[in-house]
Interface confidence: low
């Protein structure tokens, strides 16, 4: 978890003089704690933005957006923490918007955004609002709180992002898998355009089990440059083994800017159908 | 690229408990499917536990019931406790991490592993 760049970050609006600080997640109020707080944000939204940095490379951000409720105790709120948790990992960045002049009611309703929360590709966090300075010890709770799902690489817009393209989000293989005769597969896929090795990754498993029976390992060497974006074609030998027939192949790439760490494009092949055996049609009809 | 370091091997007489632990660093943006693997002079590597960034796991058979396997999120740390040890679990044992949330049933296949640790030693001895 970090901000996105790391220049100056404004929360000043008309009417409001503010800055953004580093905060560690553990306001001076929950120490000592003031006899009148703030009322809690009000219509917290979380989006997915995306936010070039100064070198130009784009990363996906948390959009956060709220606002205040329209009841007399802005005139005791002195700020905002922001919070984002990410769930997989429970680490949590903070930032604290520091009011520097008083609020007052005016004709529209006070609204707060921050989109500098840089999130990663599929990737979970809770996203939390307080306002400051937080609640007495059994005080009602100034904060809301929502979760906010990242979609992964395969998602358009994430597609093109400079974290999705460092694992290799662009290349699209076109994995074909046909069976052969003599207990062989067929696997084609498209090279990218990077002279780097390749990994197939084989297992197989028997027709209603998830239980594998057969796994290889097949290494391609590094493409030449007149071989990029060319079809490659591997044929592995199958296990003879009755019933082992469905098939997960994965290509494991490793390119420069992921090593071995790449997305990986996998294919299925299914069992073959059974045909129905026909109920057997009697040579006579009995006639009673 | 995530880094593995293995600790906490050594020796320890037969019946005895050890608890090994896999710190891992580095730049992830994805969730990881973890494994201790094992390697003894002459023989082939083989998966001994498995968990999956779910929670799951999956014991080889020869150590269900002895061996419990854990991970920590917030610290980045896998760990195998071991007990009831044998002469038979002496090995190297490897810790590995595999982008993505494997099925459990995968978690034991070395190939589905992109980075692993250099091992730490474990001697039983009778």
């Known amino acids: 978890l970090r901000l996105l760049d790391h220049r100056a970050l404004v929360c000043s609006q008309p009417g409001l003089n503010c800055t953004v600080k580093n905060s560690t997640c553990l306001d001076d109020s929950w120490i000592h704690p003031r006899n009148l707080t703030p009322s809690s944000p009000k219509d917290l939204q979380i989006q997915l933005h995306f936010a070039h940095t100064q070198q130009g490379d784009l990363f996906p951000v948390a959009h956060i957006e709220w606002t205040l409720q329209t009841d007399a105790s802005i005139l005791y709120l002195e700020g905002a923490e922001l919070s984002v948790l990410q769930l997989n990992t429970n680490e949590r960045l903070c930032v604290r918007f520091e009011f520097l002049s008083k609020l007052r009611h005016h004709h529209r309703r006070w609204r707060f955004t921050f989109s500098h929360f840089v999130v990663d590709p599929d990737q979970e966090y809770e996203v939390t609002v307080h306002h400051l300075p937080k609640p007495i010890p059994d005080g009602d709770p100034n904060h809301q709180s929502k979760n906010f799902l990242v979609p992964d690489c395969e998602h358009a817009r994430m597609k093109v992002t400079t974290p999705c393209m460092s694992s290799g989000s662009l290349w699209d293989p076109n994995i074909t898998v046909e069976t052969l005769e003599a207990h062989q597969l067929r696997v084609s896929f498209t090279l990218w355009n990077e002279s780097t090795h390749y990994q197939i990754l084989l297992t197989s498993f028997p027709h209603m089990e998830n239980h594998s029976c057969f796994e290889h390992m097949h290494h391609i060497p590094a493409p030449r440059p007149e071989e990029f974006h060319q079809r490659s074609n591997v044929t592995l030998t199958l296990r003879n083994l009755k019933g082992c027939c469905r098939h997960q192949v994965q290509i494991q790439p490793f390119f420069s800017s992921c090593l071995n760490d790449c997305l990986r494009h996998s294919a299925t092949v299914s069992c073959p159908e059974m045909p129905d055996t026909p109920e057997p049609i009697p040579d006579y009809m009995p006639l009673w | 690229q995530v880094q593995l370091q293995e600790s906490g091997g050594g020796s320890v007489q037969a019946g005895g408990s050890l608890r090994l632990s896999c710190a891992a660093s580095?730049?992830?943006?994805?969730?990881?499917?973890m494994s201790w693997f094992r390697q003894a002079p002459g023989k082939e590597r083989e998966g001994v536990a498995g968990?999956?960034?779910?929670?799951?796991?999956k014991y080889a058979d020869s150590v269900q019931g002895r061996f419990t396997i854990s991970r920590d999120n917030a610290k980045n740390t896998l760990y195998l406790q071991m007990d009831s040890l044998r002469p038979e679990d002496t090995a190297m044992y490897y810790c590995?991490?595999?982008?993505?949330?494997?099925?459990?049933?995968?978690?034991?296949?070395?190939?589905?592993?992109?980075?692993w640790g250099q091992g730490t030693q474990v001697t039983v001895s009778s």
């Open positions: 968990i999956n960034s779910d929670g799951v796991t």
């Open positions: 590995a991490a595999g982008s993505g949330n494997m099925f459990d049933f995968l978690l034991l296949s070395r190939h589905h592993y992109n980075a």
């Open positions: 580095g730049y992830t943006s994805k969730t990881y499917h």
